[in-house]
């Protein structure tokens, strides 16, 4: 969105799709006027969850959101919901801007750094461009993580933005693996953290007019090793009629890299145990976490044969978790009655040690699960 | 209107070097961080560097670290990547791309050129 | 390097229906995720940035959802020129990973 004079969407028409959210750099002094629906049919405009009144310096008018001289606590997010629906008609964030462009998906200029084809602006103190990608201060992250810290800022002349840490400059080169900086993203990455790196980071942002300064707070969480843990609930219960498709999930949670099975539970002989008191299990599917798809079992065109219960086996270099759930098949011509199926079974009563491998976990603990 | 367009694509041995271009126009190229992502045939893409607008900052993929190196000549309005000690794995259609602000999203794209390393 | 692990790999549907894609992060990204859309032959196409950000021009349709390690994009209305290859993109570490792809084919 290109403006000269002020911020504008022409004509009072109702936005196309594609209008409906946008983020908007409005320059400090600039007027605004943004449409939305219909002149009398126009939606109503709020701001931060506030209906704007239709008189004052900020208003929401017939339609149109007026700003007469953009400020700074101007910048938010503003609505416009259809009258009686509360359809959002315009999903609107303001930011406050240091140029009198305006910027959309399209174009995001920074055109203040080049100021050959600028009109000459007063000079202006630092200011956040972007705050809500400040909010989470306190980041406390698994060690071996990456740690991402973004002070986005504006000013005339364009600050600069240095890093602290604990009070020092911080540079990194003490730091194994160093640091990332990005200047353009005002932006501070330090890969595979480790509890030295427990610390306040603070953000310095400053030109000739004045200077902002933000904390973060950084903790590292030594790892404490452990079985993988599975979503509560999950595969769960799942009553499909033949000839469907069926999903069964299973998200597994590990720090240490785990191995996924799917098993079925079959009848031999019709028994579902062997003479140990260890199921007969069919392997569906086996993979690593980090396989497409693994944590999602998929049965196409479900036959009553496909019934039954099925298990999600997780394990790592600590142990075993398992959970499993039943799915009936219902007759197609009968699609009105449904089987009370049994509770999902939250098979986590074992404690297991791992060797190698998932048949190397079963073997160490004579867990025959016949195939 | 926005435009990014590849050359330098082309066949060549296991060892070997190649130097991939990128012209760009319809925006303020130096104001845009820029970055080069792959893929080879049949298969997902692959970042593989990006330098900041005023390069000030490159990174680059494991894969290729050592490699490859990416520049920029912000007068001439265009992207390099420097390849050397090519190989086979690095066979791909390679694209440049623009990075939208602050998101770091690839919000225009050239059209490819294929590099093909073989012997 | 942060994993980004997508599912399904490959999804058949029909015109009309609603289609889900999830992508998952090996560790917190916080919002710095990316989707794209590629028709073979061509260039990838950004459809939302910042996980929930629809890009001008792309229908609204498509939609975002999701912080820290799990993410999806929502096609509400899937449509006959929607049938592509789906890639989801980390921004959050300096190596910008990107998922392995989720084909939608018709049905």
């Known amino acids: 969105l290109e403006a000269s004079e002020e911020v504008e969407l022409e004509p009072c028409l109702a936005p196309s799709l594609e209008q409906q959210e946008q983020e908007l750099t409005v320059a400090l002094g600039q007027p605004v006027r943004l449409c939305c629906g219909r002149a009398e049919r126009g939606g109503h405009w709020y701001k931060e969850g506030s209906r704007l009144a239709p008189a004052g310096r900020v208003r929401g008018w017939r339609g149109r959101l007026e700003i007469a001289s953009f400020l700074p606590e101007d910048a938010g997010r503003y609505l416009c919901l259809a009258r009686g629906s509360m359809i959002v008609l315009q999903n609107l964030t303001l930011i406050t801007g240091d140029s009198l462009t305006s910027s959309n998906d399209d174009e995001d200029p920074k055109s203040h750094r080049d100021p050959s084809n600028r009109h000459s602006y007063p000079q202006q103190a630092p200011y956040w461009t972007h705050p809500q990608r400040m909010e989470k201060k306190l980041h406390a992250v698994p060690a071996g993580n990456t740690v991402k810290f973004r002070c986005p800022a504006a000013g005339n002349p364009t600050p600069t933005i240095r890093w602290l840490k604990d009070g020092q400059a911080f540079h990194g080169e003490n730091r194994i693996g160093g640091i990332r900086l990005r200047h353009q993203h005002w932006s501070l990455v330090m890969e595979s953290v480790v509890p030295s790196d427990r610390g306040t980071y603070t953000c310095l942002v400053e030109n000739a007019v004045g200077s902002i300064r933000y904390n973060y707070l950084l903790d590292v969480l030594e790892r404490s090793p452990h079985r993988p843990i599975l979503q509560a609930g999950l595969p769960a219960n799942t009553t499909a009629v033949v000839g469907s498709d069926v999903e069964l999930l299973c998200k597994v949670y590990s720090d240490a890299q785990p191995h996924i099975q799917w098993l079925k539970h079959i009848v031999i002989n019709g028994s579902s145990f062997g003479a140990d008191g260890f199921p007969y299990v069919q392997v569906l599917k086996t993979a690593d976490i980090n396989s497409s798809e693994v944590e999602v079992l998929y049965l196409r065109n479900v036959s009553a044969e496909d019934a039954g219960e099925y298990t999600c086996l997780a394990g790592n270099s600590i142990g075993l978790s398992y959970q499993s759930a039943w799915l009936t098949v219902l007759p197609e011509e009968d699609p009105t009655w449904t089987a009370a199926a049994p509770e999902a079974r939250y098979t986590d009563k074992l404690e297991f040690r791992h060797d190698s491998g998932l048949n190397d976990i079963f073997e160490a603990q004579k867990i025959e699960w016949h195939e | 209107e926005v435009q990014l367009l590849e050359s330098g694509g082309g066949l060549v041995q296991p060892g070997g070097s190649l130097r991939l271009s990128c012209a760009a126009s319809g925006f303020t190229f130096s104001d845009y961080a820029m970055s080069w992502v792959r893929q080879a045939p049949g298969k997902g893409l692959e970042w593989v560097s990006v330098?900041?607008?005023?390069?000030?900052?490159?990174h680059y993929a494991d894969s290729v670290r050592g490699r490859f190196t990416i520049s920029r000549d912000n007068s001439k309005n265009t992207l390099y990547l420097q390849m050397n000690s090519l190989r086979a794995e690095d066979t791909a259609v390679y694209y440049c791309?623009?990075?939208?602000?602050?998101?770091?999203?690839?919000?225009?794209w050239g059209q490819g050129t294929l590099v093909t390393v073989s012997s | 390097d942060i994993q980004m692990t997508q599912s399904p790999s490959s999804l058949s549907a029909s015109v009309g229906d609603r289609v889900t894609i999830t992508c998952r992060a090996s560790?917190?990204?916080?919002?710095?995720l990316n989707w794209y859309q590629q028709k073979p032959g061509k260039a990838p196409k950004l459809l939302i940035y910042d996980a929930s950000n629809l890009q001008s021009g792309v229908p609204s349709r498509f939609s975002g959802s999701g912080s820290g390690t799990d993410f999806t994009l929502t096609i509400s209305s899937l449509q006959p020129e929607d049938f592509a290859t789906y890639y989801c993109?980390?921004?959050?570490?300096?190596?910008?990973?990107f998922g392995q792809g989720t084909k939608v084919e018709i049905k």
């Open positions: 791309a623009r990075e939208r602000t602050y998101s770091s999203a690839f919000d225009y």
């Open positions: 330098i900041e607008g005023d390069a000030s900052y490159t």
């Open positions: 993109q980390q921004h959050y570490s300096p190596s910008h990973t």
């Open positions: 560790q917190d990204i916080s919002s710095d």
